[in-house]
Interface confidence: medium
């Protein structure tokens, strides 16, 4: 039985697939944006010294009650090796610098597209 149409493939998802799916989700968010994303909520800007995915998750996890980014939050947690919870504030953030969630998602999407194009899947 080599073909199991409609079933999830067994074993871990390849990094390239996970990254492509995250990109696709961010594309969906940016394209389907009617009203201001997450009611114009602001998130901390990030620096990358301890890993982009964890930093992005730490920023977005503090946005509550926004169903549009819940799937993104779950997907990012799959890329981050440690547990991230709301209220965490680490060196991954740029203090006193907040931007709108919509801008953050757009920036993250462009960066991930670049990584995908360059074959950097981890």
């Amino acid at each position: 039985l080599t073909c199991l149409g409609g079933f999830a493939s067994p074993g871990p998802v390849p990094p390239s697939t996970a990254l492509r799916e995250l990109i696709e989700e961010l594309v969906n968010i940016t394209q389907n944006q009617k009203a201001p994303l997450c009611n114009g909520s602001m998130v901390w800007s990030i620096n990358l010294t301890a890993g982009m995915y964890c930093a992005a998750l730490e920023s977005l996890i503090n946005v509550s009650g926004c169903s549009a980014i819940e799937k993104t939050q779950r997907m990012l947690s799959g890329f981050c090796p440690h547990k991230v919870s709301a209220g965490q504030f680490s060196s991954l953030h740029v203090r006193d610098t907040k931007i709108e969630v919509a801008q953050f998602v757009k920036d993250l999407l462009l960066h991930l597209k670049k990584l995908f194009r360059e074959g950097q899947f981890n």
């Epitope: 800007s45 620096n47 990358l48 982009m52 930093a55 960066h111």
Partner: nanobody, 119 residues
């Protein structure tokens, strides 16, 4: 709203040094390549240097290689250009520019800061 604000320009003697800064806001600074571009009086734009996320690798025009150093501090959303062994031909308005991740072209510019190298 994306904003880039350069500072640090001025008058310096040949052989001297200057450090330019560019304060960025309105976007996730850490995720983008950032560049310095200059325009000498009566001349066109000339690319000077580019730095990638996390600060490595960096790229330089041949005309400044070994004399200029680009750096960034993502914790301060700030881009820098350390300019040493300045020459008269380095006289220009220096612009900080954000590089679009996919198109690989400059999509936002600062207002520029003037560097004059003269004795």
């Amino acid at each position: 709203e994306v904003q880039l604000l350069e500072s640090g320009g001025g008058l310096v003697q040949p052989g001297g040094s200057l450090r330019l800064s560019c304060a960025a806001s309105g976007f996730t600074f850490a995720l983008y390549d950032m560049s310095w571009v200059r325009q000498a009086p009566g001349k066109g734009l000339e690319w000077v240097s580019t730095i990638t996320p996390l600060g490595s690798p960096t790229y330089y025009a041949d005309s400044v290689k070994g004399r200029f150093t680009i750096s960034r501090d993502d914790s301060k959303n700030t881009l820098y250009l350390q300019m040493n062994s300045l020459r008269a031909e380095d006289t220009a308005v220096y612009y900080c520019a954000k590089v679009h991740s996919v198109e690989n072209e400059f999509d936002y510019w600062g207002q520029g800061t003037l560097v004059t190298v003269s004795s």
